[in-house]
Interface confidence: low
């Protein structure tokens, strides 16, 4: 029987998105085991090592070149079929990265996303990419693909992610490809961490000696909760730079972190979040906002939370 149930399953490990010079292993799983198989490549670009060759269990491509990029299928050994081989497997697309300059990846309105809400991840470049691909770290399935939109000398694509949940949080990268070589991707964008907020109770945020301070006076923001958070994150409204500190268990059974802002020079509205070590991309609801007001010099003495907003240092707003 050559029906759908009798097709082999072709997989790429560790990922089908491979840097040029890297390695990828193709495995053809057939009839509950890895056995002898033949590989087929859709575009028939000549890769001498596997033309007409029978592989045992797996095929390791290393070092990967642009010639390896393409759409693969396998056939498993099947002694009872007229040809001796099974029906073709599912296709696996090997995408080879590092062939163009990296694009930029931005989150709008920002990388901290409330549970149930949506975030737009925008990939953009001054290279006229025809397609953009979005890939989440640790996911083996094919990256999401969108056609690039060209405007004002920039090509871009907006990937909508959501409704937000823990499974969607993580580290994202995007890639671009040009028309004639759709499986040859750019270098990856700088990684962007998308964090889901809201599944845990909000911590409380307070200021010592108080939220109204004179310029030059030292101020410390304390984030605390009865929840046993491992880490606290302090952010300032209108900005993406956040500071994090490990939580310390206090005698009153609360878990607290004290953020010294140093001699106060810069007011603003602050919030803090709690998170657990086992789930770094999942943060609590934000604390109630705390307005710190400073009379005097407006310059900032600790890394300004207004800049930058993504891993590459790009501004958060969409282009």
């Amino acid at each position: 029987h050559m029906g759908g149930q009798d097709k082999p399953f072709l997989s790429a490990w560790p990922s089908a998105v491979v840097p040029r010079g890297g390695h990828v292993t193709l495995r053809c799983h057939y009839r509950h085991r890895f056995n002898n198989f033949m590989l087929y490549k859709e575009d028939r670009i000549h890769i001498p090592i596997f033309h007409g060759r029978i592989f045992q269990e797996s095929f390791n491509m290393s070092p990967v070149t642009t010639a390896h990029a393409g759409n693969y299928t396998c056939r498993g050994s099947h002694p009872h079929s007229p040809t001796g081989w099974s029906a073709p497997s599912n296709p696996v697309v090997i995408m080879v990265t590092g062939n163009h300059r990296k694009p930029s990846l931005l989150a709008h309105p920002g990388p901290l996303v409330k549970s149930g809400e949506r975030v737009i991840l925008q990939c953009w470049s001054d290279i006229m990419f025809e397609h953009f691909f979005l890939h989440k770290e640790g996911i083996s399935k094919d990256p999401s693909r969108l056609v690039g939109q060209i405007h004002d000398g920039v090509s871009k694509a907006n990937f909508s992610i959501g409704p937000m949940m823990l499974a969607l949080a993580g580290t994202y990268r995007c890639y671009g490809s040009v028309t004639h070589t759709p499986y040859q991707l750019s270098a990856p964008s700088d990684p962007l961490d998308i964090v889901v907020t809201g599944p845990y109770e909000k911590p409380s945020l307070s200021a010592q000696p108080g939220p109204k301070v004179q310029a030059g006076e030292s101020v410390t923001l304390s984030c605390s909760s009865r929840s046993s958070y491992d880490m606290y994150h302090l952010s300032r409204e209108g900005g993406a730079h956040e500071r994090r500190l490990p939580a310390v268990r206090k005698v009153n059974r609360t878990f607290q972190a004290d953020f010294p802002l140093g001699p106060a020079t810069h007011g603003g509205t602050y919030r803090c979040f709690g998170s657990f070590r086992h789930s770094p991309y999942e943060w609590s609801d934000p604390s109630d906002p705390l307005l710190v007001s400073v009379t005097g010099n407006p310059s900032s003495s600790w890394p300004s939370p207004t800049e930058p907003s993504s891993k590459s240092g790009n501004p958060r707003h969409l282009h």
């Epitope: 730079h241 600790w302 890394p303 300004s304 930058p308 907003s309 891993k311 240092g313």
Partner: antibody
């Protein structure tokens, strides 16, 4: 490719002010922060301050009262101004681009540097 | 402010050999340390960031490791062009450099 190039007066008298320009190419000042770092003769590197992509600044707290960093995005130029110069401000002054491999906590290292410009404070 | 204590301040080594430089932070810097090579008349060159991530184009002879407050940087199979000064940089909270290590030929 990414390049940064500093230009400055070379020699400044004590108590006077300093202005150094960093001209960048290969990236946009609206996308990356630029830091200033100096190295006095025979000593190590000291971080002075940064101007972020959006124009906000941070300064080394010990020098904050004497430092000012600004930029002109259209000209791809960043400016370091320092007043009340003393002999111990004699140093090689570098500009460097800030970049990061993490969003979480936005930790920024310096990935590209200029070749530096020498400043001597002397009468 | 975080202080970075880099040691040794100078180091004699043989070509083809291996050297290790250490940096100790005054507090936990969460692996946010970078290592730079600095040759006279040039700007520092980024070799490693986030403790052990090699910058593209940097040979694998260079490596870094560590956690908490203690970090190290090694060069194996030392080549003539490696003989210069090296700095660590913490970027966990603002930015602080170590005092530098000058590498010399034995």
């Amino acid at each position: 490719q990414v390049q940064l190039k500093e230009s400055g007066p070379g020699l400044v008298a004590p108590s006077q002010s300093l202005s150094i320009t960093c001209t960048v190419s290969g990236f946009s000042l609206t996308s990356f922060g630029v830091h200033w770092v100096r190295q006095p003769p025979g000593k190590g590197l000291e971080w002075l301050g940064v101007i972020w992509a959006g124009g906000s600044t941070n300064y080394n707290s010990a020098l904050m009262s004497r430092l000012s960093i600004s930029k002109d995005n259209s000209k791809s130029q960043v400016f370091l101004k320092m007043n009340s110069l003393q002999n111990d401000d004699t140093a090689m002054y570098y500009c460097a681009r800030g970049n990061s491999n993490h969003y979480v906590s936005s930790f920024y290292y310096f990935d590209y540097w200029g070749q530096g410009t020498t400043l001597t404070v002397s009468s | 402010d975080i202080q970075m204590t880099q040691s040794p301040s100078s180091l004699s080594a043989s070509l083809g050999g291996k050297v290790t430089i250490t940096c100790k932070a005054s507090q936990d810097i969460n692996k946010y340390i970078a290592w730079y090579q600095h040759k006279p008349g040039k700007g520092p060159r980024l070799l490693i960031h986030y403790t052990s991530t090699l910058q593209p184009g940097i040979p694998s002879r260079f490596s870094g490791s560590g956690s908490g407050r203690d970090y190290s940087f090694s060069i194996s199979n030392l080549e003539p062009e490696d003989i210069t000064t090296y700095y660590c940089l913490q970027y966990d909270n603002l930015w602080t450099f170590g005092g530098g290590t000058k590498l010399e030929i034995k």
